[in-house]
Structure formats: structure tokens, C-alpha cells
Amino acid sequence: AQNITARIGEPLVLKCKGAPKKPPQRLEWKLNTGRTEAWKVLSPQGGGPWDSVARVLPNGSLFLPAVGIQDEGIFRCQAMNRNGKETKSNYRVRVYQIPGKPEIVDSASELTAGVPNKVGTCVSEGSYPAGTLSWHLDGKPLVPNEKGVSVKEQTRRHPETGLFTLQSELMVTPARGGDPRPTFSCSFSPGLPRHRALRTAPIQPRVWEPVPLEEVQLVVEPEGGAVAPGGTVTLTCEVPAQPSPQIHWMKDGVPLPLPPSPVLILPEIGPQDQGTYSCVATHSSHGPQESRAVSISIIEPGEEGPTAGSVGGSGLGTLA
């Protein structure tokens, strides 16, 4: 069978080889398509409900005024010339529709290096057959499931037209120290050969490099956190990050109801101030970061200060 590719909605003429150019003709077209269950016979004298789909022209050719998805299939013509010689024509018709230019929607303007990010969703509407979407980084194809690249795909079919809508969501994990302005694009490749790919306009998100977090240091005075009754303890939270984060204080795992401050002073220590203290630094670009915990305890006269804590009460300190 001769392969014929026709665009949906366009007319198509199939020649009946060996047919006399004018009536009377002895010819018969048979079609087996999405509109038939077996073979449908169309003859030159036939005219009827099938004319909207296919009709035999005076020269014996079969005319399809507007090819549709249901017209995919086999078309055969059997003709006899004036001398009684029989000729058969056999066509396999496949149809296609090129979608509109694909688009990237919900695109990110900024990506964070070292963590997975959604770059955007590529959408192609109105294709047949479905075809495929692929992503490119700086013009080179991105391979899903390689080097922190993942793609989530979805294909939907329009209930009336039968045309396809494709969606492809790209997630990437940019390498630290990589390109600060990578160029992403997406392209649609048709399901039928000999049709070039359609590419989206590129997007260029910025890649933000998070500064590696240095540890939050908690310095206690006196060292070791053991103090005589009535003494003073100063806790200082040191965070190297710029700009300076907000510092909150915790005692025994519970936030202290105090305004943010990098220094906590516990004057005139009493039994209620004993416990485990830590500070929490909250950065605008990161989550909260907690320091190590230190134990504050009271030494009775003649006792040596312990370095590990005892359970304390609920007294509040003073902020510097």
C-alpha cells in the first residue's frame, strides 16, 4: 500500500489507477477506516450521507473534502479499463495535526543551587498523533533521571476533536558553582516523521547560591555554666552569617517569651534559672538553626561546678 499523510481539515484526492477518465466507469472504492467496521463500498453513482467524508469524482478519484482522525485507514480502488484490464490501487492514509507553538508556563525566575527546583511546565495543544515534548538546557537535550533532572508528563485528549494536549513539568537540581543564568527551552516533536520540531521561547532563570551555613555558637560566661547562688550568667549567641539573623532563646526545649537578642543575661541566679539553654538563629533565606545546648546549674559552697546540667525552673532572664 502507498502511504499517504494528510493534514487534518485539509482536502485529499486519491487517484484510482487504470480508471477511464470519464464515465461510464467500472470502478469501486472500498474503505476500512475509523468510520467503518469492515469495508464500506463507494461507487461513482453513489452519492449520499458519505459524501461529507468521501465521494467519487467524475474522473474516478476519491475526494475527501476535509480529512479527519476517523479517516485514517486503508483505501482501495478496483477499476476496469475499456479493454477489461483490472487495476488495483491501495493507499494507507495517516493524518496529522501540528499544534500551536509550545509554551512554558509557571516558569521560575529563580532557582536554588543544590536543591530540586521546578523550572516550569511546557504545554503543547492540538497535536495529532500525540508527539513528544523534550527539554533543552543551553541548547542541549536534558535527559530525565540523570544529574538531578526529573520530568513529569501528562497527555490529555480533547473529547470532541480527538487532538492531544501535552504537558511536561521540569524539575532540576542546579550544581553549586554552575551557570548563574542557564537557558531552558522545550520542543515539540511530531509523532509523524518529516515534520520539524517546534521550540518554545527560552527562559533564563537566575541561579541563587545559598551561603553554606556556619554553626551557631553559644558562648557561656562563666565557662561551664556553673555559678554560685546569686551570681550572674551571660549567654551569647554568635552567628557568622550576614545579614544578622534574629536570635531567640530556648530553655528546656521551650521558647522563652523574650524579644529577639543575641545576648541573654541571667542575673542573681536562683534555683528556678537552672536548666538547659540554647539559642535559635532564624535567617530570612533559610530555616531556623539551633545552637548546641548548655546547662546552667547552681554550685553550693564547697562544691565543684558540673559541666552537665540539672533540670531548672521557669525564671526569666534579662536581655542585654
Epitope: 468510520r35 467496521e37 450521507p49 458519505w50 461529507s52
Partner: antibody
Framework: EVQLVESGGGLVQPGGSLRLSCAAS????????MTWVRQAPGKGLEWVAS????????YYPDSVKDRFTISRDNAKNSLYLQMNSLRAEDTAVYYC????????????WGQGTLVTVSS | DIQMTQSPSSLSASVGDRVTITCRAS??????VNWFQQKPGKAPRRLIY???NLADGVPSRFSGSRSGTDFTLTISSLQPEDFATYYC?????????FGGGTKVEIK
């Protein structure tokens, strides 16, 4: 909403003529074949004529061929049936319907218009 | 020309009954058969298209089936508003041919 409204029916003498109209709205008229169907009093449905979406091709049963002519004006979203040489057996309610080909077949109908052929 | 032989021409049934109407085509018409409902003084309304597909807005108690050149309309549980006349139509070839109709009456 698809709407088809017939008009032009009435009483006519045998051998006379009548022109029926069907005004279409609520859909892209020139995308569809159109058809006339009739129903004699107390009887079943009978196909009368069909026309393709361009108006280039028309189809009739033997019972009305050469007497009836179906036509359309796509600019006016209108379908017509010119009936000549009318006979008593043409007395019926005439319906216009959308479709008539294998793609869309009579999915919407007008309310009908009565044609009476009598002396 | 294709003949569409519809049976029965009339039937009496009660609300809740299952009703079956058949049309036999005199030659192969593929899937190109519709079913219509008509009430007195009203235009026909399409119920089933291309043998088995339920038209928009038609209750699911109506269904269509096909076996070769035999086409069946089934009403699974007859409702008071279903008492009407039903017609089949073949639209595979001209002349388009309707069945003779089946009048469904209250028993």
C-alpha cells in the same frame, strides 16, 4: 443553544407551489448539512431532502425528486424547501433538522410547519 | 433502497418495566443508525446516535445496541414521561430510511 424555526406552511391547492424556510441559530450553520423530514397526519417520519454544508450538493428520495428543491443561504443562516406540483399526499408537518450525513445526523429539529394540499 | 423493519409497532407496558424495541436493516448499514422519541404534537428528539451512543441530556435508562443488521433500543425502567412513539433511522445510504415506529402505551 441550537434553534431551528420553520415557517411558510399553509393551505395550497393540488398542483400549487409553496416555499418553506428554516431559520437557524446557535451554531455555525455553514459547517453542517441540513435536512427536511416530513410526517403525514397519523403516520411515520419520511426523509424529504438533504443539502451539504456548501449548498453544492443536494439529495432527494424518488417521491419528491424533480418537484422539490432544497437550498440554503449561509450568509443568512437559512434553509429553504421549494415545493412545486404539490399533491394531496404531500400534506404533512415539515421539519427542518441539522445534519443528514454520516458525521451528524438529525441531532436537532425545528418545531415543524404544517403544509396542507387540498382543493 | 434499504428497508428498516421496526418491531413491535405498538406495545403496552407499566412504569418500571424493561422495554425493548428492534429495527432490522435489509442490508449492512454499519453503525449508522439513530433512535428518536416523539410525543404527540412535538418534533422528534434524538436519543441514540450511531447505534450505541447516548445523546446529550438523555437519561441513562435509554441504551442502544447492535448485532449485525439488528439494532435495539432498550429502556431499562420505563418512566411516565417515556410513553411516546419511537423511530429508528438508517443514515448510511440515501434514501435515508426511518422505521415504521413503535408506540409505547400505558398498560
Amino acid at each position: 443553544e441550537v434553534q431551528l424555526v420553520e415557517s411558510g406552511g399553509g393551505l395550497v391547492q393540488p398542483g400549487g407551489s409553496l416555499r418553506l424556510s428554516c431559520a437557524a441559530s446557535g451554531f455555525t450553520f455553514n459547517n453542517y448539512w441540513m435536512t427536511w423530514v416530513r410526517q403525514a397526519p397519523g403516520k411515520g417520519l419520511e426523509w424529504v431532502a438533504s443539502i451539504d454544508n456548501s449548498g453544492d450538493n443536494t439529495y432527494y428520495p424518488d417521491s419528491v425528486k424533480d418537484r422539490f428543491t432544497i437550498s440554503r443561504d449561509n450568509a443568512k443562516n437559512s434553509l429553504y424547501l421549494q415545493m412545486n406540483s404539490l399533491r394531496a399526499e404531500d400534506t404533512a408537518v415539515y421539519y427542518c433538522a441539522r445534519g443528514g450525513d454520516i458525521k451528524v445526523s438529525l441531532d436537532h429539529w425545528g418545531q415543524g410547519t404544517l403544509v396542507t394540499v387540498s382543493s | 433502497d434499504i428497508q428498516m423493519t421496526q418491531s413491535p409497532s405498538s406495545l403496552s407496558a407499566s412504569v418500571g418495566d424493561r422495554v425493548t424495541i428492534t429495527c432490522r436493516a435489509s442490508q449492512d448499514v454499519g453503525i449508522y443508525v439513530n433512535w428518536f422519541q416523539q410525543k404527540p404534537g412535538k418534533a422528534p428528539r434524538r436519543l441514540i446516535y450511531r447505534a450505541t451512543n447516548l445523546a446529550d441530556g438523555v437519561p441513562s435508562r435509554f441504551s442502544g445496541s447492535r448485532s449485525g443488521t439488528d439494532f435495539t433500543l432498550t429502556i431499562s425502567s420505563l418512566q411516565p414521561e417515556d410513553f411516546a412513539t419511537y423511530y429508528c433511522l438508517e443514515f448510511d445510504e440515501h434514501p435515508l430510511t426511518f422505521g415504521g415506529g413503535t408506540k409505547v402505551e400505558i398498560k
